[in-house]
Amino acid sequence: EKWEETELDQLFSGPLPGRLPVNHRPFSAPHSSRDQLPPPQTGRSHPAHTAAPQVTSTASKLLPPVAFNHTIGHIVLSEHKNVKFNCSINIPNTYQETAGISWWKDGKELLGAHHSITQFYPDEEGVSIIALFSIASVQRSDNGSYFCKMKVNNREIVSDPIYVEVQGLPYFIKQPESVNVTRNTAFNLTCQAVGPPEPVNIFWVQNSSRVNEKPERSPSVLTVPGLTETAVFSCEAHNDKGLTVSKGVHINIKVIPSPPTEVHILNSTAHSILVSWVPGFDGYSPLQNCSIQVKEADRLSNGSVMVFNTSASPHLYEIQQLQALANYSIAVSCRNEIGWSAVSPWILASTTEGAPSVAPLNITVFLNESNNILDIRWTKPPIKRQDGELVGYRISHVWESAGTYKELSEEVSQNGSWAQIPVQIHNATCTVRIAAITKGGIGPFSEPVNIIIPEHSKVDYAPSSTPAPGNTDS
């Protein structure tokens, strides 16, 4: 039997199954336990959960068969309606041991929150039991096969299934998804919806206009041959109950990225600049790498651009091998699979002063015996502009004798080109080296000049000066 929802009210209005006398009041109990029995009565002196005297196997074979009464087999109704159904059974007094009726759905027992009531109708011959089940505001998840189970004399009895079919508007189990596509390149969109009722037919919609004149059975795959601009796609799912529209998805056309929106100069040294940037819009395609373009800001330069390529992430790069104390213009662009962004606006950055690249020249060392000091003289090295402004010199002097080693250094201001150092150890060798200092750091030390400090007043030094290098161009 199949019951449409218009007939549902009749389910409990007809005559009760079996042989119930007129005007007989039933005992009712909510279904909260699997072992619900009627209250003690004539012919059923044993209370619930109490074993009745065992009948012999021969006697068992003589017991009439017990089965659930035939009931409605198929209920069809719309979502959000209420539904009630039941199963009933007549149990003769000859059966000594019964357990309560339990409800099952699709092979799993229904416990807890489900609304069910079991009613008992005792008479002289036995008891009729009706298990009522109701669902308020049915949902699709209530679809399924419901049946009753009961144990009678240790034998499990199962009712025929009652198939509940909740019908409604089509329900999407796969909706189209947003994708980013290459211009004029084919791509697929998928849409799948289910009932009941089936069948479900699909119409595709692009920018509010239907794509297919004839509907396709669900599931449907739409092949779009290619787009030249962003479009919005959705699908309509139709069944006998009506229409459901999927979410609209944007299909974006991949384009070149936008240039970075910010560039930050994080740190500068004499020969490097650390830059970071904030990528612009990626053009609907992941950024693959970025390019840092660097040119000398000095207008006199020939304008050649140095290009440093780096990965797109992290958005950070240390530009190296730059000249000291120089002004640079820097711009950044990034690339995705479509192509390169425009470059960012050019920004300015400077390297700091470098350290001197040459040592002081013409170093001479004399021992002033009367004052017990070393007199050291040199000439200023040819310091380039980018080496920075000379701030002074560092003089390293190392004293070595039989059992002593002493390493000392002095710093002198840039004004002079000579210095005096007190003699530290007699009968020793003193090695002197000098380096120039700018704000950018300390330059290389000169070649060592050795002088022997005698025990007495005899002086013998060698060599006490360094020749000037061949090329002193600045």
């Epitope: 240039p259 929106t261 560039v263 930050h264 740190n267 904030v278 990528p279 606006p345 050019w346 920004i347």
Partner: antibody, heavy 128, light 111 residues
Framework: EVQLVESGGGLIQPGGSLRLSCAAS????????MSWVRQAPGKGLEWVSI???????YSASWAKGRFTISKDNSKNTLYLQMNSLRAEDTAVYYC??????????????????????WGQGTLVTVSS | DIQLTQSPSTLSASVGDRVTITCQSS????????LSWYQQKPGKPPKLLIY???DLASGVPSRFSGSGSGTEFTLTISSLQPDDFATYYC???????????FGGGTKVEIK
């Protein structure tokens, strides 16, 4: 649609405080610097403050200590907290997207390249 | 304080006229070209017209052009249209300073 919508303006007494909001849509504040600019009735434009994508802030010298720019990336909203308001703060306050910005972290300053998107503005009137 | 001075402050012109507005800075603009021009109509927010002294913003008609470098900049409207009657502002940034300076504005009105 890419747009900016300011709110929070109104009549306020001198000495009072007000917080302006600017809701951005169509782009992300987490990847764009943002700025506030004001315009007194019948007067020209005056820059107030900027916040970089990472949250570094810079303000006009006259605004320091009284006006604070901030943002909530999760809400994609820019704010301007204005305290100790004066009659001369009466103006239409615009939020604007910074098209490009260069920051010099070591020297604690940054420079706006251009303001490429503006909101409709919200009027703040400071009067007793 | 760094100042951007626009001239003239008011300009009367007719449709079809060639219009030139100048903007002078008291100090060199950052990178010599980080100067922008904005157009503002009554009751409306400003709109970016030109950046980098001479680059046209997206959607701006080609009758608008900009030129200049360092401290002297010019906005030119080659043939004034009815939609162009508005107030124009120059603006720029400077090295070593976060301030974004606006010029005083030039009102272009119908003659």
């Amino acid at each position: 649609e890419v747009q900016l919508v300011e709110s929070g303006g109104g009549l306020i007494q001198p000495g009072g405080s007000l917080r302006l909001s600017c809701a951005a849509s169509g782009f992300s504040l987490s990847s764009n610097a943002m700025s506030w600019v004001r315009q007194a009735p019948g007067k020209g434009l005056e820059w107030v403050s900027i916040i970089s994508s990472s949250g570094s802030t810079y303000s006009a010298s006259w605004a320091k200590g009284r006006f604070t720019i901030s943002k909530d990336n999760s809400k994609n909203t820019l704010y301007l907290q204005m305290n100790s308001l004066r009659a001369e703060d009466t103006a239409v306050y615009y939020c604007a997207r910074v098209g490009f910005f260069v920051g010099y972290g070591a020297y604690d300053y940054g420079i706006i390249h251009r303001l490429d998107l503006w909101g409709q503005g919200t009027l703040v009137t400071v009067s007793s | 304080d760094i100042q951007l001075t626009q001239s003239p402050s008011t300009l009367s012109a007719s449709v079809g006229d060639r219009v030139t507005i100048t903007c002078q800075s008291s100090k060199s603009i950052y990178n010599n070209n980080w100067l922008s021009w904005y157009q503002q109509k009554p009751g409306k927010p400003p709109k970016l017209l030109i950046y980098d002294a001479s680059d046209l913003a997206s959607g701006v008609p080609s009758r608008f052009s900009g030129s200049g470098s360092g401290t002297e900049f010019t906005l030119t409207i080659s043939s004034l249209q009815p939609d162009d009657f508005a107030t124009y502002y120059c603006a720029g940034g400077y090295s070593g300073d976060s301030d974004y300076a606006f010029g005083g504005g030039t009102k272009v009105e119908i003659k």
